[in-house]
């Protein structure tokens, strides 16, 4: 895999503790689940549950596993080759333009609008104008009707970081 994981903290410098397996680089790079030694001669395994690497690399450190924030559930744990997958709790969602936090879904649509999409871990409820069918911008309305959203949909990752 050639995906680059961005904005991840580095794990502390790894000095090849005895339990960390070593192997030789292949064509100068190390496989997923490893990082390269300072002299470039060895591949050192990442530590399960602590750090990871997702692709062939010449990283000097494995990448530190993400810890799910409060308000998030862990969909899958961190392995040596994949970061933790976190998802917003039911009734909350994470927007692309504010990925750092889960926000509460609205409980209903403004007057003159109808709900066409439920609250999911990655989107608020979706409202459209009754007549025109155009989408609502997403601001929380001053007055809400009694139309309410159903709880979040079944588990599906909203921000895959690995």
């Amino acid at each position: 895999e050639s995906a680059l994981i961005t904005q991840q903290d580095l794990a502390p410098q790894q000095r090849a503790a005895p339990q960390q397996k070593r192997s030789s680089p292949s064509e100068g790079l190390c496989p997923p689940g490893h990082h390269i030694s300072e002299d470039g001669r060895d591949c050192i395994s990442c530590k399960y549950g602590q750090d990871y690497s997702t692709h062939w690399n010449d990283l000097l450190f494995c990448l530190r596993c993400t810890r799910c924030d409060s308000g998030e559930v862990e969909l899958s744990p961190c392995t040596t080759t994949r970061n933790t997958v976190c998802q917003c709790e039911e009734g909350t969602f994470r927007e692309e333009d504010s990925p750092e936090m889960c926000r509460k879904c609205r409980t209903g649509c403004p007057r003159g609008m109808v709900k066409v999409g439920d609250c999911t871990p990655w989107s608020d409820i979706e409202c459209v104008h009754k007549e025109s069918g155009t989408k609502h911008s997403g601001e929380v309305p001053a007055v809400e009707e009694t139309v309410t959203s159903s709880p979040g949909t079944p588990a599906s990752p909203c921000s895959l970081s690995g």
Partner: antibody, heavy 119, light 106 residues
Framework: EVMLVESGGGLVQPGGSLRLSCAAS????????MSWVRQTPEKRLEWVAT????????YYPDSVKGRFTISRDNAKNTLYLQMSSLRAEDTAVYYC????????????WGQGTLVTVSS | DIVMTQSPSSLSASVGDRVTITCKAS??????VAWYQQKPGKAPKLLIY???TRHTGVPDRFTGSGSGTDFTLTISSLQPEDFADYFC????????FGGGTKVEIK
């Protein structure tokens, strides 16, 4: 003497494609991990792609992933960068670069080739 | 990504001056820092790697120091050929560069 000579740059429209080449000499090309690094008009340097010495493994930053492909022909001592879906922000001087022995960073760079993405 | 904050962005100095350029990493990078010199229209040239090791042929007036997050490039006595742009780079996690320092003649 290590020599890296890039070619293939030019003016291309947004959404267009371009293939850069880098001819290597003065060292055993097939033994080295190679990369492309670019320098924007504002002089900022950005790593673009890396390929293993034998060409089997590659990796990229998110900014170019899925649009750029690095490859090499060790028989011809040549490194390539295939660029597609080009954007204005891809405008830069593109350098091919060699990863040094036992230092895990770039020790030699080519002179660069200018890619301008504009309509 | 690890951000490398380089300062100053430019400086004016005279031949014989001692010049210091600093780079601050947004997180610990150990000693995985390199320094490059670039002259107009030319490729960057490696000066220092592993924070303090001089590359082959680099004069000993160039000295690198630091570890963790704070790094320094010092030119002990500036020579006419040293007026150029200088960049730091971390290579512990992928590759990111500082914004550069332009060393100009006073």
């Amino acid at each position: 003497e290590v020599m890296l000579v890039e070619s293939g740059g030019g003016l291309v429209q947004p959404g267009g494609s371009l293939r850069l080449s880098c001819a290597a000499s003065g060292f055993t090309f097939s033994s080295y991990v190679m990369s492309w690094v670019r320098q924007t008009p504002e002089k900022r340097l950005e790593w673009v792609a890396t390929i293993s010495s034998g060409g089997s493994y590659t990796y990229y930053p998110d900014s170019v992933k899925g649009r750029f492909t690095i490859s090499r022909d060790n028989a011809k001592n040549t490194l390539y960068l295939q660029m597609s879906s080009l954007r204005a922000e891809d405008t830069a001087v593109y350098y091919c670069a060699r990863r040094g022995d036992s230092m895990i960073t770039t020790d030699y760079w080519g002179q660069g080739t200018l890619v301008t993405v504009s309509s | 990504d690890i951000v490398m904050t380089q300062s100053p962005s430019s400086l004016s100095a005279s031949v014989g001056d001692r010049v210091t350029i600093t780079c601050k990493a947004s997180q610990d990078v150990g000693t995985a820092v390199a320094w490059y010199q670039q002259k107009p229209g030319k490729a960057p040239k490696l000066l220092i790697y592993w924070a303090s090791t001089r590359h082959t042929g680099v004069p000993d007036r160039f000295t690198g120091s630091g570890s963790g997050t704070d790094f320094t490039l010092t030119i002990s006595s500036l020579q006419p050929e040293d007026f150029a742009d200088y960049f730091c780079q971390q290579y512990s996690s992928y590759r990111t560069f500082g914004g550069g320092t332009k060393v100009e003649i006073k």
